[in-house]
Amino acid sequence: EEDGFCQPYRGIACARFIGNRTVYMESLHMQGEIENQITAAFTMIGTSSHLSDKCSQFAIPSLCHYAFPYCDETSSVPKPRDLCRDECEILENVLCQTEYIFARSNPMILMRLKLPNCEDLPQPESPEAANCIRIGIPMADHHHHHH
């Protein structure tokens, strides 16, 4: 049996960002499990004093696109599209610096989901990064277009 499937997103937690678009899942049953866990994580985040407004504005959609990445329509085999590295780095190092420190020291918050690691993402100018998922972080936009 192959690992990796493209299937329509059927959840609620990330519907405002993903709609019913096709997402990549590592196994057929993963979507339901991750949906339950991201719902629990968002509930926890919503009641947390550790999350600033400037962080949550972009961290929530970023987490959704990371947990349920769009399928790469240009690939002949099921393949996820990654977050854009420049946005990932601004999120981790600027907008959500204290939140990331807290999350890294409390890995159980995201349960089955790992915290995104920006080092794992292709460099912005590489061919692999051409199809990355852009959240629309203003500083990253500026950096992306002027460098």
Epitope: E26, K79, P80, D120
Partner: antibody, heavy 120, light 109 residues
Amino acid sequence: EVQLVESGGGLVQPGGSLRLSCAASGFNITGYYIHWVRQAPGKGLEWVGQISPNSGSTYSADSVKGRFTISADTSKNTAYLQMNSLRAEDTAVYYCARDSRRYVLSWDYWGQGTLVTVSS
Amino acid sequence: QAVVTQESALTTSPGETVTLTCRSSTGAVTTSNYANWVQEKPDHLFTGLIGGTNKRAPGVPARFSGSLIGDKAALTITGAQTEDEAIYFCALWYSNLWVFGGGTKLTVL
């Protein structure tokens, strides 16, 4: 079916080089870390290093730093372990294993291993 | 470099509950060590059982569970079966490297 197949092992003299391959099938390595782990005869496991094939980002054990290099070719869905300046203590069966970048799944699939013998 | 220590051998009976532990020389094992448990069966057949302290890999029977007990990571087999006879390795993450324990040989008699 998910499979990892190592190849490239063999007998090599101290100071020599070998390149091991880990060919993946049934999944796309860009969504995973590929680890190299070794087991010396009659001993336990030792982590050698890992790569995120998507970006080329690597980590490796102190015992192999400066001698071993991990790389990947995503178009071939294959990871590599380039071993230089080999020593007798590098004699072991070398395994590759996968670990999801996105989800905590443990190192669920392993290859069958390839034996590297360093001896004069 | 950290040293990870496991019981060298344990014996249990079918149906019994057995707990294997994994200690770190640097202090208490925490969730940030992302404890992994790997099973080695004869002929060097390795399977990942548990990741991130307590997450079972897909397809792993529910009798295997991971946790933290005191200052150690633990693998508990609830209702051991004869096919669980194997060597079990734990691996802990230390910021930028993984360190394996020496392995526990579990005999199910």
